[in-house]
Interface confidence: low
């Protein structure tokens, strides 16, 4: 009879993460009797995969119906490839011997590639806020993807962004890859709508892109405006002044009024009002009875906003302008903070 | 036709032993494991330990380890169990069973099982 | 050992219902579970290897997902040929070890 031939008919063979691989080999003869083993790599560094004979193979399934008495196909199905499965794979036949099986012949090999989806871009922003006119940096990561070729862009608010460098690790051969870049973006004060896109374009997605976003309003701190207006009230003696805090975010805000350096009230904004490009209004006043002062007054609306500095405006009020009504010693009143009682 | 055939009911004594055979036919013997597992009555099933019909290498249950032999004889296709120092919670129909192609450790070839009875 | 624990023990149903059987593991074992099915006086039957393929010759109606530690089995439309008990079996290590079994009994 013939002596055995081992036969690999597929040089290489690809398959996508998460799918089966089916590696074939058939043998031209039942002599030697003695089982097919499996490996990956040849020479004493071989990892067995598949013993024929014994052992735990979990992933592995033979293709053929294992019952055949004349089996002399050996292919196997290895389940739930991942990156790490891809190499040349090589089937071998022993003859049984003793004590030990003896490496009879193996096959010419068949190359494992491996495709697989780059994982979801993770995009991360600065740690802490930043304003206006400010340049900050996104980052954006995605992992296990095999072939290395791979295709990164990003967008603020669909437009392109080209201020970005990108790395993709490691740079020699490996059994799968990382992407790495960081963009550069220029915040705006109407960019607490905006969202910075991540875009990893790569072979096994067919074309549909993955997408990761980070929205802007976790990362921009728009400092407010400020305007301290005085209002006469119907009472002659009493004066309201409005302190208008104007086109803030994030909504975190706290007000103090001080009369001549000293505070008169603090609160926190609350019932604010949104405007279309996401920041916030706010409106607080203060109602003077002027005649509890001799001298003119200094009123000042001081703003904390989300933990950065006071920013403050005054406002000179006029003392003598107005009419003493004696008896009152009432220097201020907190008539509240909601615009819709002022008018 | 692809079986395993087991050998008849037994009654033995406590303090005695037993040994049950199980002869597969249909398939190449040597080339799958065979696994022993028992049923007391209406109870669930036991896991006894694993024995490569190829190598004779084993693995027993750790409860059951000193009192149970598992072997095979490839020339005639048979895996054999034997149990010592029997005891009456050892009663129980006895199966064997051969291990799949699709994963290791799933039976998907079950003998029709064996009463033995430990009884004084 | 890795413990392997079934839920329900016993369920009643009628012909045509969707039964449900859980199993769950002490320790993750990957897909290397398998579901049997007996029948009084007969031997195991394997219906569902590593975790969620179906055996040869066994009706679609069964079917077994899960992965890790937890694990189902589901005949979809009960039949009268069904009533029995069910086992789950972890094939990951040595010891292999059962679980408790379900009876599905006709209600």
């Known amino acids: 009879e013939e002596e055995l031939q081992v036969i690999q008919p597929d040089k290489s063979v690809l398959v996508a993460a998460g799918e089966t691989a089916t590696l074939r080999c058939t043998a031209t003869s039942l002599i030697p009797v003695g089982p097919i083993q499996w490996f990956r790599g040849a020479g004493p560094g071989r990892e067995l995969i598949y013993n024929q004979k014994e052992g735990h193979f979990p992933r592995v399934t033979t293709v053929s119906e294992s019952t055949k008495r004349k089996n002399m196909d050996f292919s196997i199905r290895i389940g739930n490839i991942t990156p790490a499965d891809a190499g040349t794979y090589y089937c071998v036949k022993f003859r049984k011997g003793s004590p030990d099986d003896v490496e009879f012949k193996s096959g010419a090999g068949t190359e494992l590639s491996v495709r697989a989806k780059p994982s979801a871009p993770v995009v991360s922003g600065p740690a802490a806020r930043a304003t206006p006119q400010h340049t900050v940096s996104f980052t954006c990561e995605s992992h296990g993807f095999s072939p290395r070729d791979i295709t990164l862009k990003w967008f603020k608010n669909g437009n392109e962004l080209s201020d970005f460098q990108t790395n993709v690790d490691p740079v020699g051969e490996s059994v799968s890859y990382s992407i790495h870049s960081t963009a550069k973006v220029v915040l705006t004060r109407e960019d607490v709508h905006s969202q910075v896109i991540c875009e990893v374009a790569h072979v096994t997605l067919q074309g549909d892109p993955l997408r990761g976003t980070a929205n802007l309003s976790e990362t921009i701190r728009v400092p407010p405006t400020l305007e301290v207006t005085q209002q006469p009230v119907r009472a002659e003696n009493q004066v309201n002044v409005t302190c208008q805090v104007r086109k803030f975010y994030p909504q975190r805000l706290q007000l103090t009024w001080l009369e001549n350096g000293n505070v008169s009230r603090t609160e926190t904004a609350s019932t604010v009002t949104e405007n279309k490009d996401g920041t916030y209004n706010w409106m607080s006043w203060l109602l003077v009875n002027v005649s509890a002062h001799r001298d003119d007054v200094k009123l000042t609306c001081q703003v904390e906003h989300d933990g950065q500095p006071a920013v403050s405006k005054s406002h000179d009020l006029k003392v003598s302008a107005h009419p003493k009504e004696q008896g009152s010693n009432t220097a201020a009143e907190n008539t509240g903070s909601n615009e819709r009682n002022i008018y | 036709q692809v079986q395993l055939v087991q050998s008849g009911a037994e009654v033995k004594k406590p303090g005695a032993s037993v040994k049950v055979s199980c002869k597969a036919s249909g398939y190449t013997f040597h080339g799958y494991g065979i696994s022993w597992v028992r049923q007391a009555p209406g109870q669930g099933l036991e896991w006894m330990g694993w024995?490569?019909?190829?190598?004779?290498?084993?693995n027993y249950a750790q409860k059951l380890q000193g009192r149970v032999t598992m072997t095979t004889d490839t020339s005639t296709s048979t895996a054999y169990m034997e149990l010592r120092s029997l005891r009456s919670d050892d009663t129980a129909v006895y199966y064997c069973a051969r291990e799949a192609g699709s994963s290791w450790y799933d039976f998907d070839l079950w003998g029709r099982g064996t009463l033995v009875t430990v009884s004084s | 050992d890795i413990q392997m624990t079934q839920s329900p023990s016993s369920v009643s149903a009628s012909v045509g219902d969707r039964v449900t059987i859980t199993c769950r593991a002490s320790?993750?074992?990957?897909?290397?579970l398998a579901w049997y099915q007996q029948k009084p006086g007969k031997a195991p039957k394997l219906l569902i290897y590593a975790a969620s393929n179906l055996q040869s010759g066994v009706p679609s109606r069964f079917s077994g997902s899960g992965s890790g530690t937890d694990f189902t089995l589901t005949i979809s439309s009960l039949q009268p040929e069904d009533f029995a008990t069910y086992y789950c079996?972890?094939?990951?290590?040595?010891?292999?070890?059962f679980g408790g079994g379900t009876k599905v009994e006709i209600k």
């Open positions: 320790q993750g074992i990957s897909s290397w």
């Open positions: 079996q972890q094939g990951a290590s040595f010891p292999i070890t």
């Open positions: 024995i490569s019909a190829y190598s004779g290498e084993t």
